[in-house]
Interface confidence: medium
């Protein structure tokens, strides 16, 4: 009877063999069948599931002249770069008429040196600060035991006797390398070597020491930096945005910060060229040969008000009998704060000085003592803020007021 036509008779004349090897191996599984009539398509199964995207080739050879003669069909499944996912039971499957035929199984196994699923990564850590490293490997064959190494020195007496997947490091004081070895029955695989760079700890206790209208002196406590001395610290100051910009934990300033470097020790720095009566935020980071620490939080600080840096401008003083009219303009020089008002002083020869607080007005009418016969009267004006008086103007002599007489207009008189 022709092959493949009876239920009990399998068409397969060659079944898949077995493959066992290490990762990356390339191998081929082969099955052969003899059928009468048109050759069927050969499907491959792994663990009972059809492989839709199998890398297989099918060769068909007729054994006679007639289409109804027997055919030899050979199907080859190529496994390139063997992986754990390729392992399992492989079979060939054909549909002949209303029947399904499956070959005897062949087995693909993986056995070799351990394979790393996870290896330790390079990272930076602050000195004396705990951290964890991860390493994970698998066979087969299992079990796989790990051995951690720090600066090429094993951290346990034998594989499997120390920490396995996660290594907890309580802290480092110098930059170190870590790797792990994976051991199984086939041998040893070594992971990549991770470099753990030890940076200085974040500085602490950043605070203000003293403040002037255009400068702030700040201090901080350096963090530990391991065996690497601090080379310098960097301080950044940025104008505050009325509380809308930087908050305590916000990582980056809203604008380009003013950056200053401080030699250390001392862990103190005078920040100059600031605006008076202005809120700033400051932060500090310290650097060793290994790199910089993380920044501290932004600390809000404020320069105090200063006194005005110049006297009022364009002072004019004119006198008419027992009255004098003085007026001036706001100082051109920086006020260094909020202008609260003006003080005015006037004095005649052999008479005591009279000091007046004018408030925010920029003119005043003075009632002079007597009949105005006091000679050599001079007047000075100063602007003031909450911080105090600015410089006084140079004395301005009170000039007698000389109206231009015209017949049609009466002479001007003070009210």
């Amino acid at each position: 009877a022709p092959r493949g036509t009876q239920a009990e008779e399998s068409p397969f004349v060659g079944n898949p063999g077995n493959i066992t090897g290490a990762r990356g191996l390339t191998g081929t599984l082969r099955c052969q069948l003899q059928v009468q009539g048109e050759p069927p398509e050969v499907h491959w199964l792994r663990d009972g599931q059809i492989l839709e995207l199998a890398d297989s080739t099918q060769t068909q050879v007729p054994l006679g002249e007639d289409e109804q003669d027997d055919w030899i069909v050979v199907s080859q499944l190529r496994i390139t770069s063997l992986q754990l996912s390729d392992t399992g039971q492989y079979q060939c499957l054909v549909f002949l008429g209303h029947q399904t035929f499956v070959s005897q199984p062949g087995y693909v196994g993986l056995e070799g040196l351990p394979y790393f699923l996870e290896e330790p990564e390079d990272r930076t850590v602050a000195a004396n600060t705990p951290f964890n490293l991860s390493c994970q490997a698998q066979g087969p064959p299992e079990p796989v035991d790990l051995l951690w190494l720090q600066d090429a020195v094993p951290l346990a007496t034998a594989p499997g006797h120390g920490p396995q997947r996660s290594l907890h490091v309580p802290g480092l004081n110098k930059t170190s390398s870590f790797s792990c070895e994976a051991h199984n029955a086939k041998g040893v695989t070594t992971s990549r070597t991770a470099t753990i760079t030890v940076l200085p700890q974040q500085p602490r206790n950043l605070h203000l020491v003293s403040r002037q209208p255009t400068e702030l002196e700040v201090a901080w406590t350096p963090g530990l930096s391991g065996i690497y001395p601090l080379t310098h610290c960097t301080l950044q100051a940025v104008l505050s945005d009325d509380g809308m910009g930087i908050q305590a934990g916000e990582p980056d300033p809203p604008e380009e910060p003013l950056t200053s470097q401080a030699s250390v020790p001392p862990h103190q720095l005078r920040l100059g060229s600031l605006h008076p009566h202005t809120p700033y935020h400051i932060r500090v980071a310290c650097t060793s040969s290994q790199g910089p620490s993380s920044w501290t939080h932004w600390l809000p600080v404020e320069t105090p008000e200063g006194v005005p840096l110049g006297p009022p401008e364009n002072i004019s003083a004119t006198r008419n009998g027992s009255q004098a009219f003085v007026h001036w303009q706001e100082p051109r020089a920086p006020l260094q704060g909020t202008l609260l008002g003006y003080r005015l002083a006037y004095q005649g020869q052999d008479t005591p000085e009279v000091l007046m607080d004018i408030g925010l007005r920029q003119e005043v009418t003075l009632e002079l003592q007597g009949d105005g016969s006091v000679s050599n009267l001079t007047v000075c004006v100063a602007a003031y803020t909450a911080a105090g008086d600015g410089p006084w103007s140079l004395p301005v002599p009170l000039e007698a007021w000389r109206p231009v007489k015209e017949p049609s207009t009466p002479a001007f008189s003070w009210p």
Partner: antibody
């Protein structure tokens, strides 16, 4: 290293003035910080009394304002507490301390002086 | 003035166990700049107070990380994760948001 060392009498008569000195080493009191006085009553309660700033300005607890004065001698790097018209209620341990400008955190303290007001 | 209230007034702890001390302020110590102006002091027997924590959660220089501070604007907690013999003393909270500076009544920590 900053150090604050206190001195002054341990016994003061009622209605008299209590005067204490705080001598600072390791930092100039006119270069920065607030220089505070705090007292601790026998029942452990702490009370801030006031400060003298590096720039010479003062701030006092309002409840003491009429009786307290904090002054300084920059040439000796010392600052002083004077509390007038004392009563037995002023019996306490008095501390001087350095405070930050933002916001008054006191990081270095003197050793404390126990003052008893009694006739 | 801002009133600071501490509880309990005393606490007894076994060595190696954790301890918590609470502090409450009569109004919020959260400044518009995002910082909370609360600090903790420890006064060991026969010594001056020493700064432990400032701005609610920042550890002062030289203070072991067994100490931690947390809280909201008005309710605060000091936690000691593993109490050691040297932690014995009176713990004070205080506010430095504004003058006059004010302190809590203190919590005495003892070892069982």
């Amino acid at each position: 290293q900053v150090q604050l060392v206190q001195s002054g009498p341990g016994l003061v008569k009622p209605s008299q003035s209590l005067s204490l000195t705080c001598s600072v080493t390791g930092f100039s009191i006119s270069s920065g910080y607030y220089w505070n006085w705090i007292r601790q009553f026998p029942g452990q309660k702490l009370e801030w009394m006031g400060y003298r700033s590096y720039d010479g300005s003062n701030n006092y607890d309002p409840s003491l304002k009429n009786r307290i004065s904090i002054t300084r001698d920059t040439s000796k790097n010392q600052f002083f507490l004077k509390l007038n018209s004392v009563t037995s209620e002023d019996t306490a341990t008095y501390y001087c301390a350095r405070g930050w400008l933002l916001h008054y955190t006191m990081d270095y303290w003197g050793q404390g002086t126990t003052v008893t007001v009694s006739s | 003035d801002i009133v600071m209230t501490q509880s309990p007034s005393s606490v007894s702890v076994t060595l190696g166990q954790s301890a918590s001390i609470s502090c409450r302020s009569s109004r919020s110590l959260l400044h518009s700049n995002g910082f909370t102006y609360l600090y903790w002091y420890l006064q060991k027997p026969g010594q001056s107070p020493q700064l432990l924590i400032y701005q609610m959660s920042n550890l002062a220089s030289g203070v072991p990380d067994r100490f931690s501070g947390s809280g909201s604007g008005t309710d605060f907690t000091l936690k000691i994760s593993r109490v050691e013999a040297e932690d014995v003393g009176v713990y004070y909270c205080g506010q430095n948001l504004e003058l006059p500076l004010t302190f809590g009544g203190g919590t005495k920590l003892e070892i069982k």
